[in-house]
């Protein structure tokens, strides 16, 4: 009778993560008597996957009844495959012996490759907000996929971006891989409603790519434009001055009125109006009692937006033409939009 050969008919097997891998192995003879063992890898560091003779291998089941002497099918199934299971598996026949069984013949090996889906891409933007015309960086990360081949694209509002750099790690062989990409985006004043999208395509996704998004509303700061105007006189000796704060984002804004450099009133933007582009407008007014002033008045609208250094706009109020009331202590009547009069 010919000497036993161990046949592993499949050079490679490709399995999706979470599924069951079948590793086939047959012997050409029932002689010699002795157990079959399965190993991952070769050489002294090989990992025991299944031992016919003894041990507990909860993820492994045999295809046929290995307890029987007449069995020559030593195929196994490994359940709940993960990328960590990738490698070359060897079916090895041992000859019964003491104190240890003696390795007799090995199969040629079957390479198990695991297809694992990438994790949902996570897009993150800069830690601090930036203003229009500035270039900001967005990163996209996805992990745990196999095989290594993967495609990543960036979009801004549906338009594909070209200024990005992508790395897949590790460079060499691995059970699974990660992708990291950094895209550069130039902000515009209209980007409050904009989205940056990272799209990942992989063989495991069957043509349905994964997407991660970032809203530029988290990244952009649109500084306000200020306009201070003097309204027609509401009553004799009173002038209404308004400060129009336009096109700002985010909403966090504090406005201070100064009369000749002295703080008259401070208020926080509350009842704002939203523009189509997502920016906000707000208006504050100041009722100035001109009879309280002997000289011209310099009115300043000072705005601190989103924790940034204050910006201001001034308006010179000419009072020389007006008769002056003596003995008045009240310099101005301060009124914000939709606010009651304050004395």
């Amino acid at each position: 009778e010919e000497e036993l050969q161990v046949i592993q008919p499949d050079k490679s097997v490709l399995v999706a993560a979470g599924e069951t891998a079948t590793l086939r192995c047959t012997a050409t003879s029932l002689i010699p008597v002795g157990p079959i063992q399965w190993f991952r890898g070769a050489g002294p560091g090989r990992e025991l996957i299944y031992n016919q003779k003894e041990g507990h291998f909860p993820r492994v089941t045999t295809v046929s009844d290995l307890t029987k002497r007449n069995n020559m099918d030593f195929s196994i199934r490994i359940g709940n495959i993960t990328p960590a299971d990738a490698g070359t598996y060897y079916c090895v026949k041992f000859r019964k012996g003491s104190p240890d069984d003696v390795e007799f013949k090995s199969g040629a090996g079957t390479e198990l490759s695991v297809r694992a889906k990438p994790s949902a891409p996570v897009v993150s933007g800069p830690a601090a907000r930036a203003t229009p015309q500035h270039t900001v960086s967005f990163t996209c990360e996805s992990h745990g996929f196999s095989p290594r081949d993967i495609t990543l694209k960036w979009f801004k509002n549906g338009n594909e971006l070209s200024d990005f750099q992508t790395n897949v790690d590790p460079v060499g062989e691995s059970v699974s891989y990660s992708i990291h990409s950094t895209a550069k985006v130039v902000l515009t004043r209209e980007d409050v409603h904009s989205q940056v999208i990272c799209e990942v395509a992989h063989v495991t996704l069957q043509g349905d790519p994964l997407r991660g998004t970032a809203n530029l509303s988290e990244t952009i700061r649109v500084p306000p434009t200020l306009e201070v105007t003097q309204q027609p006189v509401r009553a004799e000796n009173q002038v209404n001055v308004t400060c129009q704060v336009r096109k700002f984002y985010p909403q966090r804004l504090q406005l201070t009125w100064l009369e000749n450099g002295n703080v008259s009133r401070t208020e926080t933007a509350s009842t704002v109006t939203e523009n189509k582009d997502g920016t906000y407008n707000w208006m504050s007014w100041l009722l100035v009692n001109v009879s309280a002033h002997r000289d011209d008045v310099k009115l300043t609208c000072q705005v601190e937006h989103d924790g940034q250094p204050a910006v201001s706009k001034s308006h010179d109020l000419k009072v020389s033409a007006h008769p002056k009331e003596q003995g008045s202590n009240t310099a101005a009547e301060n009124t914000g939009s939709n606010e009651r009069n304050i004395y």
Epitope: L30, I31, K53, E54, K68, N70, K96, S98
Partner: antibody, heavy 118, light 107 residues
Amino acid sequence: EVQLVESGGGLVQPGGSLRLSCAASGFTFSSYDMHWVRQATGKGLEWVSVIGISGDTYYPGSVKGRFTISRENAKNSLYLQMNSLRAGDTAVYYCARGGNWDDAFDIWGQGTMVTVSS
Amino acid sequence: DIQMTQSPSSLSASVGDRVTITCRASQDINNYLAWFQQKPGKAPKSLIYTTSSLQSGVPSKFSGSGSGTDFTLTISSLQPEDFATYYCQQYVSYPYTFGQGTKLEIK
């Protein structure tokens, strides 16, 4: 049903010969190692011989050169040719199948009695 | 040849008892050890192979353990049908050899 049935035992004079048979049924006979085991009355078990799947044979020193094991796969039959019999060969002879992957015995016949006496 | 020594040679026990029979090999036999049960006038019955693997149809009250040279058979809760003679056997190499047997009797 897996079954082994021995036959051919009996009374034989010292120096005589006897041929035991074991008829196998219910399994693929050619795929198993087959053994003979004996037991003298009131004594323990003693392994007598084996014939492997490929026809290779082994014996203990006590019967080597006197006993010959053989098999006829086409007839699902195992044999033990016993020559130069001695009183010490008196025993019940069992055939057993090395049915487990490691050749452990899993199935035994009911036995046949061999008596060597003048 | 490898000698197999069983102890005790005989053992008295009661129904419901847990009993252990030991078997010692004269040299390392890996774990190629089997246990058999034999009742008077009957052929031996295979119980355990490869030290601890139960033959098909054998109840789980029988268990085996050990390695190298020292092995045990345990019957967890004796029933009337368990009173018999028990043999160990090494089958790592020819000639296969048996222990002398342990007779388990009702107390």
